[in-house]
């Protein structure tokens, strides 16, 4: 039984509040071999970051006026750097931190 | 120096098996990944899978699963690929061809080929 | 499964020529690309891997480059050996596949 934050590669959306705390984890990928590693592109901005292992977490407050949205790719690679599953398409909305807390002009 | 020695042309009926071979020499063995390579008469090539003789590990290229089966034999240093219920469309030149392990995963020596004719 | 097209499929070149020929990937392979070249008697040899890195023994004549999904293998100045097929392959992703081939002739 996979966690609700670990699991196998496939495409997912994930939605995260602009201005969070960084090096917060968002998910941890799951390898079946032969993949041992994995691999993010796509629109990261030095912001996301998975590690070989599958630890998909980000290093930089987000900010939603520069991005709303970032498009991201993850693969899984055996150990000749060989892409075995994916790359699979992973959808990070950036939240607006008023979003739940509405504010009234006088 | 590294060879890759194949065994010589085939010739078997439609139905049955084969068995080819590729004796690796000049190299430890099993460090090397092994692949396997089909050319069909006047075609390109097309990739079978490999296997690593270090652990026995094998990957293959779907279209290949269920026709070819590749072990080996690390006390002769020898790979092969079994090939099993054979058609006219299997008839071809078969290649082994090292793999260098890790990255970048390049084939850098070839065996001569062996032909195979599936004919009745 | 990444297709790999070759192009030309053939070509006419006198000794001397500086030819090009060009391999495109139906997606990006990361330059994960290699050369090999196939003498009429069906040997093979690894001209080429990771786009334009040159395997030891092959004469300095061949080149290769590009990125994304486009590239090319180049010969400077064709001498009588080099008229042979060449194939490139993409080892980015599993099936590893190879281009049809280029086949080199002497006009």
């Known amino acids: 039984q996979e966690g609700k934050f670990s699991g196998p590669l496939k495409p997912m959306t994930f939605s995260i509040y602009e201005g969070q705390e960084p090096s917060q984890i968002i998910f941890q990928f799951k390898a079946n071999p032969p993949a041992v590693t994995f691999e993010l592109t796509g629109e990261t901005d030095n912001i996301f970051v998975i590690e070989r292992e599958g630890l998909l977490y980000y290093n930089r407050a987000l900010d939603r006026e520069t991005r709303s949205t970032h498009n991201l790719q993850v693969a899984a690679l055996d150990a000749n750097g060989i892409i075995v599953e994916g790359p699979v398409p992973i959808t990070i909305k950036v939240k607006d931190i008023n979003d739940n807390r509405p504010t009234f002009l006088q | 120096q590294v060879q890759l020695q194949q065994s010589g042309r085939d010739l078997v009926k439609p139905g049955a098996s084969v068995k080819i071979s590729c004796k690796a020499s000049g190299y430890t063995f099993t460090d090397y990944h092994i692949n396997w390579v089909q050319q069909r008469p006047g075609q390109g090539l097309e990739w079978i899978g490999w296997i690593f003789p270090g652990s026995g590990s094998t990957y293959y290229n779907e279209k290949f699963k269920g026709k070819a089966t590749l072990n080996v034999d690390k006390s002769s240093s020898t790979a092969y690929m079994l090939l099993s219920s054979l058609t006219s469309e299997d008839s071809a030149v078969y290649f082994c061809?090292?793999?260098?392990?890790?990255?970048?995963?390049?084939?850098?020596?070839w065996g001569q080929g062996t032909t195979l004719t599936v004919s009745s | 499964d990444i297709q790999m097209i070759q192009s030309p499929s053939s070509m006419f070149a006198s000794l001397g020529d500086r030819v090009s020929l060009s391999c495109r990937a139906s997606q990006g392979i990361r330059g994960n690309l290699d050369w090999y070249q196939q003498k009429p008697g069906g040997t093979i040899k690894l001209l080429i891997y990771?786009?334009?890195n040159l395997n030891s023994g092959v004469p300095s004549r061949f080149s290769g480059s590009g990125s994304g999904s486009d590239y090319s293998l180049t010969i400077s100045s064709l001498e009588s050996e080099d008229f042979a097929d060449y194939y490139c392959?993409?080892?980015?992703?599993?099936?590893?596949?190879f281009g049809a081939g280029t086949k080199l002739e002497l006009r």
């Open positions: 061809a090292r793999g260098k392990s890790g990255y970048p995963f390049y084939f850098d020596y």
């Open positions: 990771s786009t334009s």
């Open positions: 392959l993409q080892r980015n992703a599993y099936p590893l596949t």
